[in-house]
Interface confidence: medium
């Protein structure tokens, strides 16, 4: 279907009876069928050959009788100022005028919303040659209009370095509303308010905006676009969407889901990475986030021991990383381990609980009753000590270290020993004569090696000597060593 | 500052017509509903209807379709609400009110009114 | 067509006591908003959207509500807020009917 604006077929004065045709699309000897590559040069029919085109710089005879008569002012004739039509429908339009035959290098242009129209746009330009005027029509053609074609368009052409322009042809492309605005989804506190916005445009306008709630009208009377609906608040889940409506129809807009925020579900797969005598690394994974990004995270510690008095530690950390290390744990005890995270609602109930153990720690005390005395030989020092009293929580003996650090005129020298679990006593070799021995010691559990004695000191004299007193730290552990010689 | 100044008080026989202005300046007058409202004397107060002067389109209270008709000219910023075949039922005050908010807001309240026109229907 | 009865129909206040009257709609609705109207002048618009100030309105008027029952609270009454006080209901349904208005004397 071809929207045709024809000119009235008006006799021009010097142009004998009306212009041929009405540019309708059957008319084949006037070549109206559009170019489809690039912007098309001026068509002519040359008037020695009727019906025979020709293309190429378009030059018109001059004529010499008449260079002396006054021309009349040149201008396009009056064409149809607006045309309105449906989307994808077919339109084509044209401008005419009358160029007296003494102007030459005439060419017309088409312009559209004062840009020229380059490219592959369908315009024809024809010319009716006569004795004393040649009629030219420029005609442009839209197949399938689109919105992207309202405007108004003219005709410029350029004769003798003067420009005529024609009136207006302004297009109006009308089809169904066209959202620029459409409703958002959102995540909305429970009965708080909230605005959602829709905006639609024609042609053709007015477009009246209808709200719609979970497919229920929610306004009866139709409101203008743009239309802001304020929902007073909601208490579940909605979803919305708007309809645009104008003379053309109806279009309806994306609904959108406006979800309630509600505290998180609680965090899930709560796991042990690593455990250590005095801290465990846990990840989870977290619950729904409630239609809210979650804030912080508590990971709840309980002593399972019975004879704990239950009370429950408790860490906040981020949200993110899902993982935590929990420290400041006793070592070999049992835990009950679990996490809830809150988000600007609240906080979710706690996940499910699981058992994590520590490993078992390293002493906590130093052996007691350390003494160090020089043996008769005087090639070895005899190291005696008692166990330490060691806490369940430092697991099993393994043995002790013992550390001998020699010291004469400008040496110092440590040596680590390791002995059984059983021992209570140990025999060194002098390392170093005229000198000074330091003796500490260390228990040991798989847990690792605990806190060393105060530090018990000997002098080994130069061979000779005759000292065979003992060095020795008093029971408890911890006054000053006695060096006896 | 936003005003709406109604045409003076009528005083018509029964079976009569009338036709009541309202003169809106000092904002876009095509791009806000203007309603009407009704009260007898002594009573409260009763919605008619509205129209947009944007296009024209109106929407009424059921219990006044073919009572009232509400028109508005764009160019003098005028609402107009005629009210035919009147009956001593319709001698009131007649206000006009502009709705509220964002012009495009579907909240409907009336932050503007006119001072009222007095209808009195008497033989 | 949503019915708003507003009570009491009549009350007195003394100067600087609080005052509340309510509303109640004949089905949930949107937002009430209301107007003061003395004699011989046009309503004016206090309360917008339930809660809203409209501008102008001194700070000691307020209002509340949501569903079915609202309410215009004065927090201090004064001489000048003796009037007849009507609520107008939102619901996205025209028409948009008022209550039958409370009259507010000052003792």
């Known amino acids: 279907a071809i929207t045709e604006a024809r000119e009235e077929a008006k006799p021009y004065p010097l142009f004998p009876g009306p212009l041929p045709g009405s540019l309708q699309t059957d008319h084949t000897s006037l070549l109206s069928l559009p170019h489809t590559s690039g912007y098309q040069p001026a068509l002519m029919f040359s008037p020695t050959q009727p019906g025979r085109p020709y293309t190429g710089n378009v030059a018109i005879p001059r004529v010499t009788s008449a260079g002396s008569k006054l021309l009349p002012p040149l201008a396009f004739k009056h064409t149809v100022g607006h045309i309105i039509l449906s989307e994808h429908k077919d339109v084509k339009f044209n401008c005419s005028i009358s160029v007296p035959n003494i102007y030459q290098d005439t060419t017309i242009s088409w312009w559209k919303d004062g840009k020229e129209l380059l490219g592959a746009h369908h315009a024809i330009t024809q010319f009716y040659p006569d004795d004393e005027v040649t009629a030219i029509i420029a005609s442009f053609s839209i197949t399938s209009v689109q919105r992207s074609d309202n405007g108004s368009y003219i005709c410029k052409m350029k004769i003798n370095n003067e420009e005529i322009v024609s009136d207006p042809i302004y297009i109006e492309v009308q089809g169904l509303p066209h959202f620029t605005k459409q409703p958002e989804s959102m995540n909305v506190t429970r009965n708080t308010a909230f605005n959602l916005t829709c905006q639609a445009v024609g042609p053709p306008e007015p477009v009246n905006i209808f709200w719609v709630q979970n497919s229920s009208r929610v306004n009866e009377q139709p409101e203008k676009s743009p239309s802001v609906l304020t929902v007073p608040g909601l208490t579940e889940m909605a979803v919305f969407s708007c309809e645009a409506h104008n003379d053309k129809g109806l279009t309806v807009s994306k609904g959108v889901q406006i979800n309630i925020k509600a505290i998180p579900s609680p965090p899930t797969e709560v796991s042990i990475h690593n455990s250590t005598a005095h801290s465990i690394l846990i990840s989870w994974v977290p619950g729904f986030d409630g239609y809210s990004p979650f804030r912080n995270c508590s990971v709840q510690v309980k002593e399972v021991d019975p004879l704990s008095n239950g009370s429950v530690m408790i860490f906040n950390t981020s949200a993110s990383p899902h993982m935590y290390q929990i420290k400041q744990l006793q070592a070999l005890a049992n835990y009950s381990i679990g996490v809830s995270c809150m988000n600007e609602i609240g906080w979710s109930a706690v996940s499910p609980w699981i058992l994590a153990s520590t490993t078992e720690g390293a002493p906590s005390v130093a052996p007691l009753n350390v003494t160090v005395f020089l043996n008769e030989s005087r090639d070895n020092v005899d190291i005696r000590w008692m166990k330490p009293l060691t806490k369940r929580q430092a697991g099993e003996l393994v043995g002790y270290r013992i550390s001998h650090v020699w010291q004469s005129a400008g040496i110092s020298k440590e040596l680590l020993e390791e002995v059984g679990q059983n021992n209570s006593r140990a025999q060194i070799s002098v390392q170093v004569h005229n000198a000074t021995c330091t003796v500490r010691i260390a228990a040991v559990t798989k847990g690792g090696v605990g806190p060393f004695s105060d530090p018990v000191k000997i002098f080994i004299p130069a061979h000779g000597w005759v000292d065979h007193a003992p060095s020795s730290t008093p029971a408890p552990g911890n006054a000053d060593p006695v060096l006896i010689i | 500052q936003v005003q709406l100044q109604q045409s003076g008080p009528e005083l018509v026989k029964p079976g009569a017509s009338v036709k009541i202005s309202c003169k809106a300046s000092?904002?876009?007058?095509?791009?806000?509903?203007m309603n009407w409202v009704k009260q007898r004397p002594g009573k409260g107060l009763e919605w008619i209807g509205r129209i947009y002067p944007g296009d024209g389109d109106t929407n009424y209270n059921g219990k006044f379709k073919g009572k009232a008709t509400l028109t508005a000219d764009k160019s003098s910023n005028t609402a107009y609400m005629q009210l035919n075949s009147l009956t001593s039922e319709d001698s009131a005050v007649y206000f006009c009110?502009?709705?509220?908010?964002?012009?495009?807001?579907?909240?409907?309240?009336?932050?503007?009114w006119g001072q009222g026109t007095t209808l009195t229907v008497s033989s | 067509q949503i019915v708003l009865t507003q009570s009491p129909a009549i009350m007195s206040a003394s100067p600087g006591v609080k005052v509340t009257m309510t509303c109640s709609a004949s089905?949930?609705?949107?937002?009430m908003h209301w107007y003061q109207q003395k004699p011989g002048s046009s309503p004016r618009l206090l309360i917008y959207d339930t809660s809203n100030l409209a501008s102008g309105v001194p700070v000691r008027f307020s209002g509340s509500g949501s569903g079915t029952s609202y309410s215009l609270t004065i927090s201090r009454m004064e001489a000048e807020d003796a009037a007849t006080y009507y609520c107008?209901?939102?619901?996205?349904?025209?028409?948009?009917?008022f209550g039958g208005g409370t009259k507010l004397e000052i003792k």
């Open positions: 009110a502009r709705k509220g908010g964002y012009y495009y807001s579907i909240s409907n309240y009336f932050d503007y």
């Open positions: 107008q209901q939102w619901s996205s349904y025209p028409p948009y009917t």
């Open positions: 000092d904002y876009e007058f095509s791009r806000s509903w």
């Open positions: 089905s949930s609705v949107s937002y």
